[in-house]
C-alpha cells in the first residue's frame, strides 16, 4: 500500500493543501485513496511512513510576523483532528520572495478509515511547479 | 533491495552529483547498483522510496539570482529523463556563505533498468563533509 | 519493527537530544527500545530507515558564527560512535529568533544492540512544540 500525490493550486481559501493524481504519481491499489483532493485515506490498520514536502516562496516584509508552518495532520474516525508533524521556516528577506523547502516524515499507526492531510499557514505562498510539493505514504 | 551512497567531490562541470560506496554506505545486493558514480540503477520493477539529502553553502551576492535547486531525476529505458522531486532554497546573506540542507523523498514506480540521479544548480556549493550529502532508495 | 519518539526539553547541558514515548508516538514491539530517553536501540541485525526532524529557533547575532548542525549518530557495541547523517542551517537574521526545520533520513545496516541518537550544536535552540521535533526508525 503506497501513495504519492502532486500538489494542485486551489482557489479555495482553506489552509488545507490540495493534491491530484497527476504527473508521476503513485496509487498502488484501492486500499489507499485520495479523497476530495485533500486527504489520503487508508482502509487497513497498521504502521505507515507518511511524508510531505512543501516548497514555498515568501518575503518577511510581505508576510505576517509568524513563520511559515507546514503541518501533517491526522483525522481518525470518531476522533478529533490532531497534528502528527510540523515544520517551521522563517520568511526570507529576498525579494520579491525567497523560496524554501520543508520536508516532513514519520512512522505512525493508522486505523481503518483514518485520513492524513497537510495544512499550511499561507497556501498562496506554496510552489506548485513540477516536483516542488508532494505528499505520500507507504505501509510498513 | 536498498542503497545509501555518499557524496563525492568532482572536478567535472556537470550538474549531476557524484556518489561513492564509501564510509557508512549501504548496497544490499546486486539488484541495485551505483553506475558511473552518478546514478542508482535497479534491476527489478516495483515501488521504491527514493531520497536524497544535499547540504550546500552559498551567498546571495556571490550567486545567481535564482535559488539553489536540488532535483531528483529519473531515466527509464527508452524514455526521457524527468524530474520526480525538486526543492529550492534561496541563498543566504551570511558571509562567506551560509549553509543550508535540503531533503527530498518520495515513493515511485521504477521499471527494470531505471536509473535515478540528483541534479543541482551549482555543484561547487555542495558540502561533502561526513554525513552532509547522501542519496539512497529502498524497495517496498 | 518501528519507532517514532517525541522531543523532550531537558535541563541537561548535553548536546544529545532527549526523547519520550508521549503524544502520538510509535513503539511497535520490544525489538526496539528508547534507552535513557536519548537513544533508540535495536535487538535485531538488519537494514533500517532512520530519520530525525529538528526544528530550532536561532538568531545570527545571538549565536556562534558556526551554523546549527543536527547529526544522526550510531553507537554499535564495541565500536566508536560515528556520524551517519548531518544537516546544517545558518542562523536566521530574524529577531528575536528565526525558526527553521531540518530533516535527516537514510538507510543503514544496524547490528544487534546498536543505538542511534541525535546530536545538535545548541539544544537550547530546539523547538519542542507538538510535532516540531521527532526521531524514528523502521526495519526494512
Amino acid at each position: 500500500i503506497a501513495a504519492h500525490v502532486i500538489s494542485e493550486a486551489s482557489s479555495k481559501t482553506t489552509s488545507v493543501l490540495q493534491w491530484a493524481e497527476k504527473g508521476y504519481y503513485t496509487m498502488s491499489n484501492n486500499l489507499v485513496t485520495l479523497e476530495n483532493g485533500k486527504q489520503l485515506t487508508v482502509k487497513r490498520q497498521g504502521l505507515y511512513y507518511i511524508y510531505a514536502q512543501v516548497t514555498f516562496c515568501s518575503n518577511r516584509e510581505a508576510s505576517s510576523q509568524a513563520p511559515f508552518i507546514a503541518s501533517l495532520c491526522l483525522k481518525s474516525p470518531g476522533r478529533f483532528e490532531r497534528i502528527l508533524l510540523r515544520a517551521a521556516n522563517t520568511h526570507s528577506s529576498a525579494k520579491p520572495c525567497g523560496q524554501q523547502s520543508i520536508h516532513l516524515g514519520g512512522v505512525f499507526e493508522l486505523q481503518p478509515g483514518a485520513s492524513v492531510f497537510v495544512n499550511v499557514t499561507d497556501p498562496s505562498q506554496v510552489s506548485h511547479g513540477t516536483g516542488f510539493t508532494s505528499f505520500g505514504l507507504l505501509k510498513l | 533491495i536498498a542503497a545509501h551512497v555518499i557524496s563525492e567531490a568532482s572536478s567535472k562541470t556537470t550538474s549531476v552529483l557524484q556518489w561513492a560506496e564509501k564510509g557508512y554506505y549501504t548496497m544490499s545486493n546486486n539488484l541495485v547498483t551505483l553506475e558511473n558514480g552518478k546514478q542508482l540503477t535497479v534491476k527489478r520493477q516495483g515501488l521504491y522510496y527514493i531520497y536524497a539529502q544535499v547540504t550546500f553553502c552559498s551567498n546571495r551576492e556571490a550567486s545567481s539570482q535564482a535559488p539553489f535547486i536540488a532535483s531528483l531525476c529519473l531515466k527509464s529505458p527508452g524514455r526521457f529523463e524527468r524530474i520526480l522531486l525538486r526543492a529550492a532554497n534561496t541563498h543566504s546573506s551570511a558571509k562567506p556563505c551560509g549553509q543550508q540542507s535540503i531533503h527530498l523523498g518520495g515513493v515511485f514506480e521504477l521499471q527494470p533498468g531505471a536509473s535515478v540521479f540528483v541534479n543541482v544548480t551549482d555543484p561547487s556549493q555542495v558540502s561533502h563533509g561526513t554525513g552532509f550529502t547522501s542519496f539512497g532508495l529502498l524497495k517496498l | 519493527i518501528a519507532a517514532h519518539v517525541i522531543s523532550e526539553a531537558s535541563s541537561k547541558t548535553t548536546s544529545v537530544l532527549q526523547w519520550a514515548e508521549k503524544g502520538y508516538y510509535t513503539m511497535s514491539n520490544n525489538l526496539v527500545t528508547l534507552e535513557n530517553g536519548k537513544q533508540l536501540t535495536v535487538k535485531r541485525q538488519g537494514l533500517y530507515y532512520i530519520y530525525a526532524q529538528v526544528t530550532f529557533c536561532s538568531n545570527r547575532e545571538a549565536s556562534s558564527q558556526a551554523p546549527f548542525i543536527a547529526s544522526l549518530c550510531l553507537k554499535s557495541p564495541g565500536r566508536f560512535e560515528r556520524i551517519l547523517l548531518r544537516a546544517a542551517n545558518t542562523h536566521s537574521s530574524a529577531k528575536p529568533c528565526g525558526q527553521q526545520s531540518i530533516h535527516l533520513g537514510g538507510v543503514f545496516e544496524l547490528q544487534p544492540g546498536a543505538s542511534v541518537f541525535v546530536n545538535v550544536t545548541d539544544p537550547s535552540q530546539v523547538s519542542h512544540g507538538t510535532g516540531f521535533t521527532s526521531f524514528g526508525l523502521l526495519k526494512l
Epitope: A20, E21, G23, Y24, G129 | S76, R82, I83, E109 | -
Partner: nanobody, 118 residues
C-alpha cells in the same frame, strides 16, 4: 475514450518552420504529461519531446534541442510543437502522445506527416 487529433503537418523547405497541434479529449488533459513521437520512413519510433502537466518542465531529444519547442494550453486541451530550422532528417509522421508511466502505457494519435524537402 481517449482521442488525440494531430494537425499542422505538410511540406516545408529545409530551414523552414511548422507548428503542429494536437486536440485531446476523453481524459483530464491537465493531469498528464504529453509528448510528441515521430517515425521516419523505414525507421522505428523516436521520442521527440515531452512536457509535464503544469507545463513548466520540458524535455527534448538531442536531435531537436534548440530547434523544437513543445507547449500546452490546458484550458484548450491542446498540445503544440513549434518546429524551426527544419532539416531533411526531420521528415517523419509525427504522433501526439499521452505519456504515462503508471501503468507503463502511452496513447497515440493517428499522426500528421511532415516532409522537409527542397
Amino acid at each position: 475514450e481517449v482521442q488525440l487529433l494531430e494537425s499542422g503537418g505538410g511540406l516545408v523547405q529545409p530551414g523552414g518552420s511548422l507548428r503542429l497541434s494536437c486536440a485531446a479529449s476523453g481524459f483530464t488533459f491537465q493531469m498528464y504529461p504529453m509528448g510528441w513521437v515521430r517515425q521516419a520512413p523505414g525507421k522505428g519510433l523516436e521520442w521527440v519531446s515531452m512536457i509535464e502537466p503544469a507545463g513548466d518542465l520540458t524535455y527534448y531529444a538531442d536531435s531537436v534541442k534548440g530547434r523544437f519547442t513543445i507547449s500546452r494550453d490546458n484550458s484548450k486541451n491542446t498540445l503544440y510543437l513549434q518546429m524551426n530550422s527544419l532539416r531533411a532528417e526531420d521528415t517523419a509522421v509525427y504522433y501526439c502522445a499521452k505519456y504515462q508511466e503508471q501503468p507503463w502505457f502511452d496513447y497515440w494519435g493517428q499522426g500528421t506527416l511532415v516532409t522537409v524537402s527542397s
